[in-house]
Every structure is written in structure tokens, then in C-alpha cells.
């Protein structure tokens, strides 16, 4: 056979054996002569023109450009292509020689104890196991193990060719660890060398860097970056890194395969980049690439190298945070620093700890902010290495939408005697204070409370047309007083009052307060009655364990069937934006009470007595009287508040003081409690007696010592006592200077 095409000047080398295939027996001598037109060389199997000892290439005796190849005692392994060619050209002549060695039918590469075949698990892919034959027409099968399986040529996808080897679809042997070819000659079996099966994959699922972001160090520290490639099974991986300072002395790269869990369809490879002592020039982007040959994936992270540990607040750090009651407040700490600082939060100087309402850390979180959360919050950052500290103050202002104090106490319907002057009050608490409080009104009959028309049980008034109180046409004559500001329960509140000159018409009044974060309203049912009247005996608010009587007085010529009821146990709910339910329409929700009836010439008086009043007794009491003629029921409501008993308490301290003789000392001792305590003063544990120079005023609250003398020096005690006990405060008064002698003799 010829390889290459003859050029104009050169003919192909000519072989002494003019055939493509030569078959000879083992142990015979192979001799082929090649003639040509210029310098020739030979190539033969297993030694591509090397110095094989058994092969002899000699110059022909009869001519130039002629070489003879001789192999004495050929063996099966000498099977293959013998090529004669012109040096430095592609012009060649080839003969394929089969050395039939029935004891060794497979050609083995001299160096091979075993071979390797690489396969993919691709269903469509075939693989060739290169078990070449020294005999062209052998009966060859392929054995795979373990478990042992035998494959025989099927004339289709499984075949054996003596010059090529055994061809088989790769998936058929992908399970096997090794394969070999086997030939049967005269009932004898001959095996090729073993071929190890290596299944090759290529797919990389992902490449992950760890730490994945925000890698920060300071000069001299060690940088360790891990790059993990997750791949399908049977993949080999090349790693490479790209980083800023490529000429690094202390860089270490370690690549290794991670152990694959059994049953896992994934393999992991790890490459670790280590720089023992980073410098500023190591700052920058670090990229790790993993490659299988058919697929490359990479990932990057930025490494920041600081000159030294530091800490500072970021520019985005807030100084004022505004929130509305009930909201979740988040104050994030914005800092620059390495390493990450320790963070401590303080409120008004007191350390804050995490609990169910507050979470402290990189973000201060107040779950449901309330007014008491208002204040100055200090965050202190401490660098864990240098111990450098930075602090920043955040002022939290908590806004409160208008809350109308009376709403929580309000009776469902208050009744007012016809013709009387009445004052309606709205006490508003809001932060910031309301920018306006407006009053509106509506006639009661414009809001009928018939079940068919009712909007809902809790909001039975289907009224919408509220009118401004300036327009009191058809209603009661009204005057709105200027808002007043009062300190109530330690809170600054805005009080708006509406004066009804004469209670002539039953109406609904609404006060509406608005500030920057919301609005609040209160609806007052102003029910005018010519009916019964309720009074309290004694007319002060009772304290626990005191007795009180509720008197309901009605003209006996007009009314009959006087009855006391109590609203309870809870008043009817009054939701925001809803109106109170008229009591007379809901008597079935009330408790009927025992009472005693008295009569005089004009009135019936129904007395309900509460002996030893308790806090449970407070609430709304309703007196119902029936019109003798029309049988219409008239209801009057009175709210009873029972004051809690509170042990005496002295607010404020008495201060020690030094005074000169002849001067005046004025001290005050304010006590609270229920029942109100009695105040007494003592000097050096003796009751202080008033005289011309010692004056006690305002129920002993204020002590004045005029023209002090040396003997006024001592320990002064203010003691407040009630049936619930005593409270006391003390101060030492020092009197300086010499006493002037008075000569009266």
C-alpha cells in the first residue's frame, strides 16, 4: 500500500513483497526489502524506528537507496504495520504483517502489564479496547468484571477487528473495573492484557469560594481561601488562581479531592490558597477557576487588606430616628472596621440586653416601640485587637397618635338634666401634641338606633353627617373653650372643653384630634332627660373600704318602676371610630341590683348602698324610670370611680442645709396616698412644736423657721401617716455663726 502521492520527481518506495497484508507463521524469518530514489528509513510495530535488538535494517549490497528489514524468529507481537519512507517526507509504502502465533493471539505492548480505557457513560458512545490480533479471523469476546460479564460480537454495535481491537458501546462496560479480550483456538482460551476502565465525566456544577465575601485582614495576618468545585462523578479537575500579587513569596496552593459520600452523585474538589503574612499589595480580587477540560467555572471574592486594626462609624449612621407607637424600630449599626467590632448598646447610660421586646447587636431592634423607649441610645464599638472605642448617639423619638383619655372610662350614654349647663371634655394625649382638636355634633334622632337600621352591634349609629359646632342651628347653644395644657399622670395633655349653655336637645358630640402621625376621636352621647336624677352620698369619690350610696330621685307623679342596674362586668366595647351603644336599648345586657325605695311628698328615691366599696364596684350604674303615661323608659347613667387605697409616699427629698443664724429656712414635704396622709414634723425625734419662729402651713406640708437660732440645729423629720402606714424623710440643718447675747437684766 502507498501513503502520500508521488511527486513529479519522486516515486513511492517499492517493497519486495507487493501486497497490503502478509500472513506468516511464528518463529519464521520476516525479510522485506525497500528500494527508492533517495535516503530511506523503516518503521515497525512496538518500536517506531527505534533500536529494537531483534530487528536488523541493512543496506542492500546491490544498490544505492535500498534497505532490507530482517526479523528472525518472529513472534505474535511483531504483528502490525511495516512502513518504508523517504526521510523528511510523507511518501511511504506500508505492508501489514500478521505473525500467526496460536499460543499468543493478542499483541501486547512490550511495556504494558495493563492498559487503560477511558469511557463516558454516554449511551451513544462506543469505546475501542485495543486488543489487536496476530491472527485476522479470530473468535474474540470481551470479558468485563466484576460481576463477570461476557460480550460477543453481534455484527452491529459490538465487533472485533484485528487491526483496531474490540468495539463496544461504552455504557455496557461502565459498571466494570476492568476488561480483557479472550480468543478461543481449538478449545483453548487466550487472554489479552487487562484494561482498567476509567469512566470520564466533565460537568462542573458549581465553584464556591469560602469565605464567599467580605474577606478582611490586616497586614501580617494569614489569608486562607478555600475553593470547592462540585462535579459529577468521574471528573478530573485542574484548579487555577488569579490574585493581585502574583510574585508572592509565602503563597501556598494545596489541591485535593474530598471524600465522596457513598450513594452521592457528586464529587468535591478543594483548592486552598494560603498567604502567610499578607501585605497591602495582596488586596484585590481573588479568582479561582476549576476546569475539567470540557467545562470551566470560576468564582471571585474581594480581599481587603488594612494597614492596621481600626474602627469607625459609617457615614450612613443615623442620629435621629422617628417612630410611631407600636411600630418595629430597626437602628442598624453602620461601621467600617477590621476586625468586626464588639457592639454594645446603652440607653440613657444603662447597658441594653436582648429580651423578648428588644434585640441588640448589629441592629438594635425594638419589637413594638412604646413611649418609654424614647431617649438617647448610645452604641459603642470596640476593636477587639486594638481596643479602640468609638461611640455614637442615636435619639429615638416615639410619636403617639392622639389618644383621648376619657375614651377608656366613658359611659355608653350619659344623661343630662334638661336645661342645665354642661361641660364636655376631651383630654388628648399625643406626641407631638395635636395641631388641632375639632368638635362636631349631630341630633340624636338623626342617628336612630333601630335594629333594622343598625350598622353593627358595636356601632349602632348609622350617622355620617357630622356638623361643625359653629353651626348649632337646631341644636344646643355651644361655646368651645380655648385648649388648655395640663400635666396629668406625669404627661403633658391637651384639654379641649365644649360648654353647652342649656341642655335642650339630645345630640351626639364628637371631638377629633389630629397630629402628624394619626387621629383620634371620641363620641359623646349627650342624652337630655327630664327624667330621674342621680346623686352620690357623700358626693366625693369613695376610696376602697368606704361606704357610698347612689340615689336615684324621680318625680313620682311622672315616673314609676324605678330600678337600678349595673353595666358589666365590662362596659360595652367602644372601638376606635365607633359610637357607644345607647343603654335603654340594651337593658338585657345589664345586671339588676337590689335597692331600697323611699318616698317624700314629691319624689320617689331609690337608694343603692355600697358598704365597704371595692375596686370591683366601680363602673356605670343605670337608673331606669318608666313614664306613667307613655310607658317609655328613661335611663340615666352615672359613672362611679372607686379610688384605690395607696400607702403614704413622700415625693422629693429633704436636703441637708447649712444656714446662718438669723436667716430663714423654708422646706416643703409633699405627700400622696389614699386616704390622704397626715403630715407631722419632728426635730431630733421629738414632735416639732409651733412657736413664734416655727410655722407649719398647708396641712403641715410647708415648714418655715424664721430668725434661726443655734438651738434650731438638728435632725428634722417629715412623716406622713395614714391607716395604711407611714413614710418619712430626714434632713440635718446646720446653723452657723455666733449667737448674739440679749441682755434683758
Amino acid at each position: 500500500a502507498s501513503v502520500g502521492l508521488p511527486s513529479v520527481s519522486l516515486d513511492l518506495p517499492r517493497l519486495s513483497i507487493q501486497k497490503d497484508i502478509l500472513t506468516i507463521k511464528a518463529n519464521t524469518t520476516l525479510q522485506i526489502t525497500c528500494r527508492g530514489q533517495r535516503d530511506l528509513d523503516w518503521l515497525w510495530p512496538n518500536n517506531q524506528s527505534g533500536s529494537e535488538q531483534r530487528v536488523e535494517v541493512t543496506e542492500c549490497s546491490d544498490g544505492l537507496f535500498c534497505k532490507t528489514l530482517t526479523i528472525p524468529k518472529v513472534i505474535g507481537n511483531d504483528t502490525g504495520a511495516y512502513k518504508c519512507f523517504y526521510r523528511e517526507t510523507d511518501l511511504a509504502s506500508v505492508i501489514y504483517v500478521y505473525v500467526q502465533d496460536y499460543r499468543s493471539p493478542f499483541i501486547a505492548s512490550v511495556s504494558d502489564q495493563h492498559g487503560v480505557v477511558y469511557i463516558t457513560e454516554n449511551k451513544n458512545k462506543t469505546v475501542v479496547i485495543p486488543c489487536l490480533g496476530s491472527i485476522s479471523n479470530l473468535n474474540v469476546s470481551l470479558c468485563a468484571r466484576y460481576p463477570e460479564k461476557r460480550f460477543v460480537p453481534d455484527g452491529n454495535r459490538i465487533s472485533w477487528d484485528s487491526k483496531k481491537g474490540f468495539t463496544i458501546p461504552s455504557y455496557m462496560i461502565s459498571y466494570a473495573g476492568m476488561v480483557f479480550c479472550e480468543a478461543k483456538i481449538n478449545d483453548e482460551s487466550y487472554q489479552s492484557i487487562m484494561y482498567i476502565v476509567v469512566v470520564v465525566g466533565y460537568r462542573i456544577y458549581d465553584v464556591v469560594l469560602s469565605p464567599s465575601h467580605g474577606v478582611e485582614l490586616s497586614v501580617g495576618e494569614k489569608l486562607v481561601l478555600n475553593c470547592t468545585a462540585r462535579t459529577e462523578l468521574n471528573v478530573g479537575i485542574d484548579f487555577n488562581w488569579e490574585y493581585p500579587s502574583s510574585k508572592h513569596q509565602h503563597k501556598k496552593l494545596v489541591n485535593r479531592d474530598l471524600k465522596t459520600q457513598s450513594g452521592s452523585e457528586m464529587k468535591k474538589f478543594l483548592s486552598t490558597l494560603t498567604i502567610d503574612g499578607v501585605t497591602r499589595s495582596d488586596q484585590g480580587l481573588y479568582t479561582c477557576a476549576a476546569s475539567s477540560g470540557l467545562m470551566t467555572k470560576k468564582n471571585s471574592t474581594f480581599v481587603r487588606v488594612h494597614e492596621k486594626p481600626f474602627v469607625a462609624f459609617g457615614s450612613g449612621m443615623e442620629s435621629l430616628v422617628e417612630a410611631t407607637v407600636g411600630e418595629r424600630v430597626r437602628i442598624p449599626v453602620k461601621y467600617l472596621g477590621y476586625p468586626p467590632p464588639e457592639i454594645k448598646w446603652y440607653k440613657n447610660g444603662i447597658p441594653l440586653e436582648s429580651n423578648h421586646t428588644v434585640k441588640v447587636g448589629h441592629v438594635l431592634t425594638i419589637m413594638e416601640v412604646s413611649e418609654r423607649d424614647t431617649g438617647n441610645y448610645t452604641v459603642i464599638l470596640t476593636n477587639p485587637i486594638s481596643k479602640e472605642k468609638q461611640s455614637h448617639v442615636v435619639s429615638l423619638v416615639v410619636y403617639v397618635p392622639p389618644q383621648i383619655g376619657e375614651k377608656s372610662l366613658i359611659s355608653p350614654v350619659d344623661s343630662y338634666q334638661y336645661g342645665t349647663t354642661q361641660t364636655l371634655t376631651c383630654t388628648v394625649y399625643a406626641i407631638p401634641p395635636p395641631h388641632h382638636i375639632h368638635w362636631y355634633w349631630q341630633l340624636e334622632e338623626e342617628c336612630p338606633n333601630e335594629p333594622s337600621q343598625a350598622v353593627s352591634v358595636t356601632n349602632p349609629y348609622p350617622c355620617e353627617e357630622w356638623r361643625s359646632v359653629e353651626d348649632f342651628q337646631g341644636g344646643n347653644k355651644i361655646e368651645v373653650n380655648k385648649n388648655q395644657f395640663a400635666l396629668i399622670e406625669g404627661k403633658n395633655k391637651t384639654v379641649s372643653t365644649l360648654v353647652i349653655q342649656a341642655a335642650n336637645v339630645s345630640a351626639l358630640y364628637k371631638c377629633e384630634a389630629v397630629n402628624k402621625v394619626g387621629r383620634g376621636e371620641r363620641v359623646i352621647s349627650f342624652h337630655v332627660t327630664r327624667g330621674p336624677e342621680i346623686t352620690l352620698q357623700p358626693d366625693l369619690q369613695p376610696t376602697e373600704q368606704e361606704s357610698v350610696s347612689l340615689w336615684c330621685t324621680a318625680d313620682k307623679s311622672t315616673f314609676e318602676n324605678l330600678t337600678w342596674y349595673k353595666l358589666g362586668p365590662q362596659p360595652l366595647p367602644v372601638h376606635v371610630g365607633e359610637l357607644p351603644t345607647p343603654v335603654c336599648k340594651n337593658l338585657d345586657t345589664l345586671w339588676k341590683l337590689n335597692a331600697t325605695i323611699f318616698s317624700n311628698s314629691t319624689n320617689d328615691i331609690l337608694i343603692m348602698e355600697l358598704k365597704n366599696a371595692s375596686l370591683q364596684d366601680q363602673g356605670d350604674y343605670v337608673c331606669v324610670a318608666q313614664d306613667r303615661k307613655t310607658k317609655k323608659r328613661h335611663c340615666v347613667v352615672r359613672q362611679l370611680t372607686v379610688l384605690e387605697r395607696v400607702a403614704p409616699m413622700i415625693t422629693g427629698n429633704l436636703e441637708n442645709q447649712t444656714t446662718s443664724i438669723g436667716e430663714t429656712i423654708e422646706v416643703s414635704c409633699t405627700a400622696s396616698g389614699n386616704p390622704p396622709p397626715q403630715i407631722m414634723w419632728f426635730k431630733d425625734n421629738e414632735t416639732l412644736v409651733e412657736d413664734s419662729g416655727i410655722v407649719l402651713k398647708d396641712g403641715n406640708r410647708n415648714l418655715t423657721i424664721r430668725r434661726v437660732r443655734k438651738e434650731d440645729e438638728g435632725l428634722y423629720t417629715c412623716q406622713a401617716c395614714s391607716v395604711l402606714g407611714c413614710a418619712k424623710v430626714e434632713a440635718f440643718f446646720i446653723i452657723e455663726g455666733a449667737q448674739e447675747k440679749t441682755n434683758l437684766e
Epitope: 460537568r203 488569579e242 479568582t287 476546569s291
Partner: antibody, heavy 117, light 112 residues
Framework: EVQLVESGGDLVKPGGSLKLSCAAS????????MSWVRQTPDKRLEWVAS????????YYADSVEGRFTISRENAKNTLFLQMNSLKSEDTALYYC??????????WGHGTTLTVSS | DVMITQDELSNPVTFGESVSISCRSS???????????LNWFLQRPGQSPQLLIY???TRASGVSDRFSGSGSGTDFTLEISRVKAEDVGIYYC?????????FGSGTKLEIK
Amino acid sequence: EVQLVESGGDLVKPGGSLKLSCAASGFTFSMYGMSWVRQTPDKRLEWVASISIGGSYTYYADSVEGRFTISRENAKNTLFLQMNSLKSEDTALYYCAREMDGNYDYWGHGTTLTVSS
Amino acid sequence: DVMITQDELSNPVTFGESVSISCRSSKSLLYKDGKTYLNWFLQRPGQSPQLLIYLMSTRASGVSDRFSGSGSGTDFTLEISRVKAEDVGIYYCQQLVEYPFTFGSGTKLEIK
């Protein structure tokens, strides 16, 4: 700007050998897999060979297995394709292509190999 | 090997119109990771191929949003809206689900 410039294409006789080169610039060569893809005279594209970033892993099309060798020299930003025992069916325009995530995102302009006697 | 089939020519299209180029695979290109490994390339006259779409529907960097890819496991479509003169060339699809990665024979965009 990413650039791939192939060279070395020539007219070769069947059975002959040739080495193609691809000079890369404008990117970090050692961080990308590289491939050779050829376009036959009838305009069909055929993947030829691929190599991993460090050169440890190579893949070949069945049609060139055992005859072609892909290699790279990262220090010189160069990709090679050594072609032996050339056949007439190897006649094509040979492109070198950059690979990331399996995708050939940049291709050179190609170099022509003609195998003919 | 996975066979990729393409029509030699597209339906003739006028500039400004839309055109669809189809590609069929002998095997599903939906891999077990849930991704479909099909790419589209454009080879303009006298130029080398340029990656347009990868993973069936993701546009390569710098590719106009007039190009969009879609399909199922074996049937794929490249849609070009408002065709321009610069879109003329041969469109190749390529599978990456199985080695060796194979290309379709290419579809030439035909202009009326």
C-alpha cells in the same frame, strides 16, 4: 479587549503533520478552558478538542483521537493543536475558542488547513 | 452522539418582521440539574461564530433583546424580532448535555 489569533494553517499532503497555534490576549488565559472547533467547506461546525486550564485534561472528537494533540503554554498565552496523519476530511477552517461554563464565548478568526495531494 | 437537526434555510423574512429558527435534538437536552444545555450562535458573513444564547434562553453579554430562545427538551426555537440587516448570517445551535458537544448544520437567515 479579548483577542484570539490563530496561525499555522497550510496546504498539507495526506499523512502529513502540522501544528496550529492560537495567541490569546485581553484576558487571563490560564483561567479559561480552550477548545479547537473546525468549520468544514460545507459550513458545518465540528468540535475538535478541548483542554483544561492547567493542561492536565484533554478531550478529542472521535474523528481525530490518536492523531491530534491539544496543548497549551500558559506562560506564553498560547494554545496549540498538533495534527498528525492528516486526512483530506481534516480540510477545514480551524477556530480556537475560549470556554467558560462550557460555552464558547469568544472565537478567533480562524486559520485554514487544506489536506490535498 | 447527540444529533442536532436544523433546516437549511429560514422562512424568507422582510426587515422589521419577526422570524423563528428551529432546532431539534435526538435526545433531551434537559439535564438533571434542571437546566437545558442548548446554545445558539450566529455567524455573520466573513466572521467567526458569536454566542447569542446559552442554557436555551439566557442571552449572552452584549446581545440585543431582540433575540430570545425557548423550547422543550428536544425542540428549540430562536426568535428574532424586528429583523435588521446585521442579523443576516448562519444560525447554529449546539448541545452541551453530552460529550462530544455537537452542532446543528446551521440555518441561513433568508431575506425576501
